[in-house]
């Protein structure tokens, strides 16, 4: 039996990434941190996405290098340059599009050695949900309303005092397609509201998840929302 | 540091199985291709195949009806297995990382490469 | 399969000497070409990587450039310690027929 012990070898740094989502129209980031480096110079950051022939982004010697950028990104992308130097390698990219989900690779070489870390970048559209009682209607009624989603999420209701109820019944949800006929309004309309009762209204798609909250007694309404991206994992 | 470390049998009789292992220590085992190479005595490199941590395999068509290469990622280990050997198979027996990710279009070269290990196949 | 040619297959020169080595695939192959070299006994060292991107800690007297089908690998000013064998790799597979560098 011959063992070969090998002699040769390169330092590994680590590389963190942790998994996102954009929302298409507005800016997002893809995040990445390394073991930082003292000179900037010796830094080259390498954003890749799969199936893409070009790069993502390039940062080298302490600025931009786009010469193989790939045509999809042109223009769009950004390192965060003064963070650099601390470890922080994350990608700014704007005007989110549908196209940029994928598997992403955040490649780091410094002269302590080189690492990589792939993340998974979901895109879609959500936004904060806002729920209003509806004086419009013959019976009490809330309204709740949220400008842009994609995918068609789901729409669920639930109060605080009947914990566990099913609301399908007595609540109707339309989905209005945007003006640029990709995101969707979301309409869902809850009726037979009692008062001194807290309700919520739950937009999910397999992104985000938004609440809207509003609390109606016989002085005042109070509102309250809140949104939570899904499926954030490091790697 | 990036190491790896190979073993296996170097001498063996025609029609064996030659069967390498090659260890990764001091780095990720994703990430990375994890290829085979050997070299014939006074001859040039010549690349058997690779293997990447999920398992998908790459070979040389020359060799490939007789080339296996497996991964156990809860030892960062990597192996060969070359069936029905002959004398023409005698070489060094390279294990190396390359930089390349499977549906990423991008190769940044093997940059680290075992010591070798000697294989001789004689009657 | 693509074939990489290598050429000279031998080249005599001396120390001081500017030294080219060339490297033809027989179709495109943009830009995923790698450099080695390697001493008598010794296993390969990665000197460039997509055909002009020096390795970490390669010095700067070695340089690699071309695409498509025609790649070379240049040392500015010849050492004592660059006298090996050098080989030409494609994508992550086959390796070109090696050119040795000897002293004159």
């Known amino acids: 039996l011959i063992i070969g012990f090998g002699i040769s070898g390169r330092h590994s740094i680590t590389v963190t990434t942790v998994a996102s989502a954009g929302n298409i129209g507005e800016d997002g980031i893809l995040s990445c941190t390394f073991e930082p480096d003292i000179k900037l110079s010796d830094i080259v950051i390498q954003w890749l996405k799969e199936g893409v022939l070009g790069l993502v982004h390039e940062f080298k010697e302490g600025k931009d290098e786009l010469s193989e950028q790939d045509e999809m990104f042109r223009g769009r992308t950004a390192v965060f340059a003064d963070q650099v130097i601390v470890g922080n390698a994350s990608l700014r990219l704007k005007n989110v599009q549908l196209t940029d989900a994928g598997t992403y690779k955040c490649y780091i070489i410094t002269s302590k050695g080189k690492g990589n870390a792939n993340l998974e970048y979901k895109t879609g559209a959500f936004s904060m949900p806002e729920v209003n009682v509806d004086y419009n209607a013959s019976s009490e009624t809330l309204r709740c309303e949220a400008p842009r989603w994609f995918p068609q999420p789901t729409v669920v209701w639930a109060s605080q005092v009947d914990q566990g109820a099913n609301f399908s019944e007595v609540s109707n949800t339309s989905f209005e397609l945007n003006s640029e006929n990709v995101t969707m309004k979301v309409v869902s309309v809850l009726y037979n509201v009692t008062i001194n009762n807290t309700y919520s209204c739950m937009i999910e798609n397999d992104i985000a998840k938004a609440t809207g909250d509003i609390k109606v007694t016989e002085s005042e309404i109070k509102r309250r929302s809140h949104l939570q991206l899904l499926n954030s994992k490091a790697s | 540091q990036v190491q790896l470390q190979q073993w296996g049998a170097g001498l063996l009789k025609p029609s064996e199985t030659l069967s390498l292992t090659c260890a990764v220590y001091?780095?990720?085992?994703?990430?990375?291709?994890w290829s085979w190479i050997r070299q014939p005595p006074g001859k040039g490199l010549e690349w058997i195949g690779e293997i990447n941590h999920s398992g998908n395999t790459n070979y040389n068509p020359s060799l490939k009806s007789r080339v296996t290469i497996s991964v156990d990622t809860s030892k960062n280990q990597f192996s060969l297995k070359l069936s029905s050997v002959t004398a023409a198979d005698t070489a060094v027996y390279y294990c190396a990382r390359a930089g390349g990710d499977y549906g990423f279009y991008y190769y940044y070269g093997m940059d680290v490469w075992g010591q070798g290990t000697t294989v001789t196949v004689s009657s | 399969d693509i074939q990489l040619t290598q050429s000279p297959s031998t080249l005599s020169a001396s120390v001081g000497d500017r030294v080219t080595i060339t490297c033809r695939a027989s179709?495109?192959?943009?830009?995923?070409l790698a450099w080695y070299q390697q001493k008598p006994g010794k296993a390969p060292e990665l000197l460039v990587y997509k055909a002009s991107r020096l390795e970490s800690g390669v010095p700067s007297r070695f340089s690699g450039s071309g695409s498509g089908t025609e790649f070379t690998l240049t040392i500015s000013s010849l050492q004592p310690d660059d006298f090996a064998t050098y080989y030409c790799q494609q994508y992550n597979s086959y390796f070109g027929g090696g050119t040795k560098v000897e002293i004159k």
């Open positions: 001091g780095g990720p085992f994703s990430g990375y291709f």
């Open positions: 179709q495109s192959i943009s830009s995923w």
